[in-house]
């Protein structure tokens, strides 16, 4: 079966939207009205990976772009990046682990844990207009909870 994907936008628990900041970075900020059109649309693909009770492995691509969120070590620290891929080969069922996130969905709140680096989560800062990053703490200052809005294909 082909990989099933859905199109969606994500907002953090403070209702900040995610937008492109340069070619390979996302940032989070509050948007209103027509500015909402700036927010990135993700193609969330359901991929094969380790599953546990409340975790569903997904890959997060940018819709109609050959870019995927991935987790790599930079200066010995797990880091979130946007990585360019060959669109002929992606998405695929068995994505490389750096592209895989464990989607944890409880009461309409979502967390995205890195499969490559357990207990590291896609995070945003409390401050406006800051990069989306991979954070190693949950429940602290940084925000790891998101809501998902479906976008029709």
């Amino acid at each position: 079966a082909p990989v099933r994907s859905l199109n969606c936008t994500l907002r953090d628990s403070q209702q900040k939207s995610l937008v492109m900041s340069g070619p390979y970075e996302l940032k989070a900020l509050h948007l209103q009205g027509q500015d909402m059109e700036q927010q990135v649309v993700f193609s969330m693909s359901f991929v094969q990976g380790e599953e546990s009770n409340d975790k569903i492995p997904v890959a997060l691509g940018l819709k109609e772009k050959n870019l995927y969120l991935s987790c790599v070590l930079k200066d010995d620290k797990p880091t979130l990046q946007l990585e360019s891929v060959d669109p002929k080969n992606y998405p695929k069922k068995k994505m490389e682990k750096r592209f895989v996130f464990n989607k944890i969905e409880i009461n309409n709140k979502l967390e995205f844990e890195s499969a490559q680096f357990p207990n590291w989560y896609i995070s945003t800062s409390q401050a406006e207009n800051m990069p989306v990053f991979l954070g190693g703490t949950k429940g602290g200052q940084d925000i790891t909870d998101f809501t998902m809005q479906f976008v029709s294909s």
């Epitope: 079966a1 099933r4 859905l6 359901f46 990976g49 989607k103």
Partner: antibody, heavy 120, light 111 residues
Framework: QVTLRESGPALVKPTQTLTLTCTFS??????????VSWIRQPPGKALEWLAL???????YYTTSLKTRLTISKDTSKNQVVLTMTNMDPVDTATYYC????????????WGQGTVVTVSS | QSVLTQPPSVSEAPRQRVTISCSGS????????VNWYQQLPGKAPKLLIY???LLSSGVSDRFSGSKSGTSASLAISGLQSEDEADYYC???????????FGGGTKLTVLG
Amino acid sequence: QVTLRESGPALVKPTQTLTLTCTFSGFSLSTSGMWVSWIRQPPGKALEWLALIDWGDDKYYTTSLKTRLTISKDTSKNQVVLTMTNMDPVDTATYYCARMREGSRAFDIWGQGTVVTVSS
Amino acid sequence: QSVLTQPPSVSEAPRQRVTISCSGSSSNIGDNAVNWYQQLPGKAPKLLIYNDDLLSSGVSDRFSGSKSGTSASLAISGLQSEDEADYYCAAWDDSLNGPVFGGGTKLTVLG
């Protein structure tokens, strides 16, 4: 803790319609990537997949029984219902519901099953 | 007749290793994940292996799965009497647009 429980009549007459309910807890069928399925097993025989419903209300049926089966969900009640029309003695089986997840498409948690006998 | 083909039965002595084969086609095993289930007598099936070779939570590492082309196999090492059960392989089938099961293999632990 994820659990699923099947309920429905133990005995149905030939030509009647069977209605089975799967009541689950510990997960939500509104969670993207979740599915619930029905599978049956006639006495002494192999497992046979019947129907699937996913978080987005997409429905899938086994080809041989497609015209007789209807699957539906009530997300607020955490229930999935299967109806099977025109029951026949060969439909006598243990009927299971199970959770499935997109990705592996594995039935990771099963109910205990309910035995349905078709006899006049 | 089942879409996936398994031997009806296998038997082996305690503490030995046994493998159960599962043969399919390009529309199922060839292009989709293989999952294995154990069904103890009178019980509901239980997931053992998913995504070809990943061990389900709480399952003994005496169980392992592998896949090559359109065939898969389940291996059980250090056989114990409590392993006596029916074992089923399954995979999504793209042609049928749904999951398919093997006919099941009855494992007997001798002695």
